[in-house]
């Protein structure tokens, strides 16, 4: 039995920040779980982890180069990514594992979310306004 995951197909980070919501077909309330966010088509780079259990505060881990926070809903984990760089534009996959109570469960691979990080383009003001017409 696998947990199903829904993600937005695409998100645009205009201000170098984005909220990526991972919605699960499973209620995480009073469960011990590990939710993670993976970068790249092969999910090779794990960039954020949210660990939760019934007795402790939510714990959030960010890989060096990523600034991550996490929020828990009954059937969702939202990853808040800040200070993103243009070169971090990629596809990101949500993963979930539930360890307790048994049985161990994980998810079917989701379709992922393309996060497009838009660079901040400042409008150039002309240094020289040019000759004024009489």
């Amino acid at each position: 039995n696998k947990i199903l995951v829904k993600q937005s197909p695409m998100l645009v980070a205009y201000d170098n920040a984005v909220n990526l919501s991972c919605k699960y077909s499973y209620n995480l309330f009073s469960r011990e779980f590990r939710a993670s966010l993976h970068k790249g088509l092969d999910s090779a780079v794990e960039v954020c982890v949210v660990y939760g259990n019934y007795s402790q505060q939510l714990q959030v881990y960010s890989k060096t180069g990523f600034n991550c926070d996490g929020k828990l809903g009954n059937e969702s984990v939202t990853f808040y990514l800040q200070n993103l760089y243009v070169n971090q534009t990629d596809i990101y996959f949500c993963k979930i594992e539930v360890m307790y109570p048994p049985p161990y469960l994980d998810n079917e691979k989701s379709n992922g979310t393309i996060i497009h990080v838009k660079g901040k383009h400042l409008c150039p003001s002309p240094l020289f306004p040019g000759p004024s017409k009489p």
């Epitope: 011990e32 993670s36 794990e46 982890v49 714990q59 881990y61 594992e97």
Partner: nanobody
Framework: EVQLVESGGGEVQPGGSLRLSCAAS????????MGWFRQAPGKEREFVAA????????DYAESVKGRFTISRDNAKNTVYLEMNSLRAEDTAVYYC?????????????????WGQGTLVTVKP
């Protein structure tokens, strides 16, 4: 809940070698990392080395690069620290740590569980 048990500490002469082991037990996820930190008397606990479950990410403190090697046996849930060319300044209590992060984190705050520590003494 994760339990960590270290072994392998002892006294050795400068230039000598030791191998530390740390066995983890409890509920494990598909990825996590384990690391070694050390604490000399009167000093802060400092990062030594770390490795993740997939063994595709390892990191070392500059002071031990080329002398120490971290490895792990996933079947035994055990991580090892091979220490060669030991120096007097390596004398410390060595602690094994466990983190739910899936990379070789050098940040002490990322580690959720700690072993009891094993003493390494390097002296002539």
């Amino acid at each position: 809940e994760v339990q960590l048990v270290e072994s392998g500490g002892g006294e050795v002469q400068p230039g000598g070698s030791l191998r530390l082991s740390c066995a983890a037990s409890g509920r494990m996820f598909s990825n996590y990392a384990m690391g070694w930190f050390r604490q000399a008397p009167g000093k802060e606990r400092e990062f030594v080395a770390a490795i993740n479950y997939r063994r595709d990410d390892a990191d070392y403190a500059e002071s031990v690069k080329g002398r120490f090697t971290i490895s792990r046996d996933n079947a035994k849930n055990t991580v090892y620290l091979e220490m060669n060319s030991l120096r007097a300044e390596d004398t410390a209590v060595y602690y094994c740590g466990f983190t739910y992060a899936g990379w070789a984190s050098s940040r002490r705050d990322d580690y959720n569980y700690w072993g009891q520590g094993t003493l390494v003494t390097v002296k002539p």
